[in-house]
Interface confidence: low
């Protein structure tokens, strides 16, 4: 029977610098169980080396010298008794590139180099990047464990050193950032920032890094309401806004959050199932009416929580004046002025630019004021005839503005008749 020496191993293998590779291998050799049982030794040699005195790259023979440059990096894996010659190569170096052959020795009879099945190893530049693993989504305030690992790396060779960098890590102890794992409690402001893990093999020039952009989920922390690009002041979840009646109003509600909160506007203080008047962050009123006083609520809905702000709208108006108009009545000249304003205005009468305040002590004039709905009325009664042409004015004012009107009273009662005095406003 012909002696059978066979080796199953791949012809070539490629590995990136600094990484590991496992080369599966099996062999057979002639052996009879009635032989004596000397130990079975196997060896991997660099191609071209002479087995009898060359240093090996890997062996199970404790008495053979191993090349210092492959010591601990090239290892036999598996059970050689079961004819497993698999070779593990760790922390691959450029200088490892080349051919290798396998040899078996057992007693005097079995000494064989499998020269016809050489292993060609090619070490290429490191392009593999580490992976940063963490459970997504990152949630603001929730501690999350991140780990950094390099696919294809293993324990062989000098240890790997890690360094983490990124704005989200600023408060951490520097020592923490030198481990392959770290615990991060992200903040809303960490959303969109970069986190980098860099790996380096101690004593080697090989470094690689991976940068990820953090996607931090966070509920809205604040709501800001903008009018014409200017933020309104918010106190205790309420903002106050005075608006001129009839004016167009465009408000923008903003609630930074990730993913973006669903923003909506409601009239008044809404119930949970209320229907919004706007399903965006924008509230537009073409003409503000006094009926809209009371306000609106901007609500930001988010999977992690919701927030709302009440906008107390105070609708104001400049005084609107009707009059004055004057007529002769039994008790004398009766002048009336009507006005409307929010807030309610003050009013004064003038006779020839001289203010008429209260009621005359001599009884020469009398002022009465009343209000009905949004309008207020004031009347002035002048007793007696006119000695000359007179100008009667009424003026209404509030904090937002004033308006006045006047009428020229012509001398001689006959000129006036009983109707309205001709006015020169």
């Amino acid at each position: 029977e012909k002696p059978v020496y066979e080796l199953q191993v791949q012809k070539s293998v490629t590995v990136q610098e600094g990484l590991c590779v496992l080369v599966p291998c099996s062999f057979s050799y002639p052996w009879r169980s009635w032989y004596s049982s000397p130990p079975l030794y196997v060896y991997w040699f660099r191609d071209g080396e002479i087995p009898y005195y060359a240093e090996v790259v890997a062996t199970n023979n404790p008495d053979r010298r191993v090349k210092p440059e492959t010591q601990g990096r090239f290892r036999l894996l598996g059970d050689v008794q079961k004819k497993n010659c698999s070779l593990s190569i760790g922390d691959a170096r450029m200088e490892d590139t080349g051919s290798y052959f396998f040899r078996v020795e057992r007693g005097r009879d079995v000494k064989y180099s499998y020269q016809q099945n050489k292993l060609n190893l090619e070490v290429t530049a490191l392009i593999e990047k580490p992976d940063i693993h963490f459970l997504e989504p990152l949630e603001s305030g929730r501690p999350t464990r991140l780990s950094c690992s390099l696919p294809g790396s293993c324990e062989a060779g000098p240890p790997l050193t890690f360094s983490w960098t990124g704005n989200a890590l600023s408060p951490l102890d520097p020592e923490t950032t030198r481990s392959s794992e770290l615990t991060l409690t992200p903040r809303p402001e960490d959303h969109g920032t970069n986190l980098t893990c860099q790996m380096k093999r101690q004593g080697a020039q090989v470094t690689t890094e991976r940068t990820v952009q953090l996607n931090v989920s966070y509920a809205p922390q604040t709501i800001t309401i903008f009018r014409n690009g200017i933020a309104l002041e918010i106190l205790q979840n309420t903002s106050y806004l005075p608006v001129l009646e009839g004016q167009a109003l465009r408000l923008l509600c903003d609630a930074p959050s990730n993913p973006p909160a669903h923003l909506s506007w409601f009239q008044g203080s809404p119930a949970l199932n209320a229907t919004p008047i706007s399903n965006t962050g924008i509230l537009e009123l073409r003409r503000v009416r006094s009926a809209e006083e009371g306000g609106f609520t901007c609500r930001a809905q988010h999977p992690l929580g919701f927030l709302q702000i009440f906008l107390n709208l105070s609708v104001y108006s400049l005084p609107q004046l009707l009059g004055p108009s004057c007529s002769w009545e039994a008790e004398g000249l009766h002048c009336r002025c009507s006005f409307r304003a929010r807030p309610a205005p003050s009013l004064c009468w003038r006779l020839e630019e001289k203010p008429l305040e209260g009621n005359s002590s001599q009884g020469s004039f009398k002022v009465n004021s009343s209000s009905a709905g949004p309008w207020a009325n004031s009347s002035l009664i002048l007793h007696g005839g006119l000695s000359s042409d007179l100008k009667v004015s009424c003026k209404a004012w509030n904090i937002y503005g004033s308006q006045s009107g006047s009428v020229l009273l012509l001398q001689g009662r006959s000129n006036l008749g009983t109707g309205v005095v001709p006015a020169a406003l």
């Epitope: 669903h262 909506s264 229907t275 999977p303 929580g305």
Partner: antibody, heavy 118, light 107 residues
Framework: EIQLQQSGPELVKPGASVKVSCKAS????????MYWVKQSHGKSLECFGY????????YYNQKFKGKATLTVDKSSSTAFMHLNSLTSEDSAVYYC???????????WGQGTLVTVSA | DIVMTQSQKFMSTSVGDRVSVTCKAS??????VAWYQQKPGQSPKSLIY???YRYSGVPDRFTGSGSGTDFTLTISNVQSEDLAEYFC?????????FGSGTKLEIK
């Protein structure tokens, strides 16, 4: 009162297509996403996808992509789901429902039974 | 996709009893979970939103609890009209996903 009124049951042949409608009333139609949910006989509920009536933009669950086309007609406040290349696997009750952000899915249509049979 | 697991397919209870239906999410979904009741031949009825809030008109014997990944719907003082199938649903991320359902049987 908010209501979602769906079209009636459909019996169709394999390979054919069908269009299910959902008419919304009682709220501002363009303000909320309209969801379509599938429930096969005796099984759980599966989200088919949704459409934003405001801009007509659909989102399809990857599992059902290519099976349905979602559209809306804003003028009649109606959402449509067009199912194509029907097989017996598509026999199910299809519901429309509107999604209200933080509040989930408070309102559902009465469902439309689609039966695919030769 | 987030998987919502309702491990109990059937639950048996008596009128007046208290029963808890559980639901587990494969990822943290915060409190974005809703519960629905479905009776044969009817569309689902919304019971609970945001894990613990009852929709208006839902009897207060229905209560929801939980956050993160574990959620519970509790029905205290079970009534015969509560005979139905109950589904949980997450709306934390698309696509919205539902549990497989738990059928409540009245002894």
């Amino acid at each position: 009162e908010i209501q979602l009124q769906q079209s009636g049951p459909e019996l169709v042949k394999p390979g054919a297509s069908v269009k299910v409608s959902c008419k919304a009333s009682g709220y501002s139609f363009t303000d909320y996403n309209m969801y379509w949910v599938k429930q096969s006989h005796g099984k759980s509920l599966e989200c088919f996808g949704y459409i934003d009536p405001y801009n007509g933009g659909p989102y399809y669950n990857q599992k059902f992509k290519g099976k349905a086309t979602l559209t809306v007609d804003k003028s009649s406040s109606t959402a449509f789901m067009h199912l194509n290349s029907l097989t017996s696997e598509d026999s199910a009750v299809y519901y429309c429902a509107f999604y209200y952000g933080y509040y989930g899915v408070p309102y559902w249509g009465q469902g439309t039974l689609v039966t695919v049979s030769a | 996709d987030i998987v919502m697991t309702q491990s109990q397919k059937f639950m048996s209870t008596s009128v007046g009893d208290r029963v808890s239906v559980t639901c587990k999410a494969s990822h943290n979904v915060g409190t974005s979970v809703a519960w629905y009741q479905q009776k044969p031949g009817q569309s689902p009825k919304s019971l609970i939103y945001s894990a613990s809030y009852r929709y208006s008109g839902v009897p207060d014997r229905f209560t929801g609890s939980g956050s993160g990944t574990d959620f519970t719907l509790t029905i205290s003082n079970v009534q015969s009209e509560d005979l139905a199938e109950y589904f949980c649903q997450q709306y934390n991320s698309y696509p919205l996903t539902f549990g497989s359902g738990t059928k409540l049987e009245i002894k």
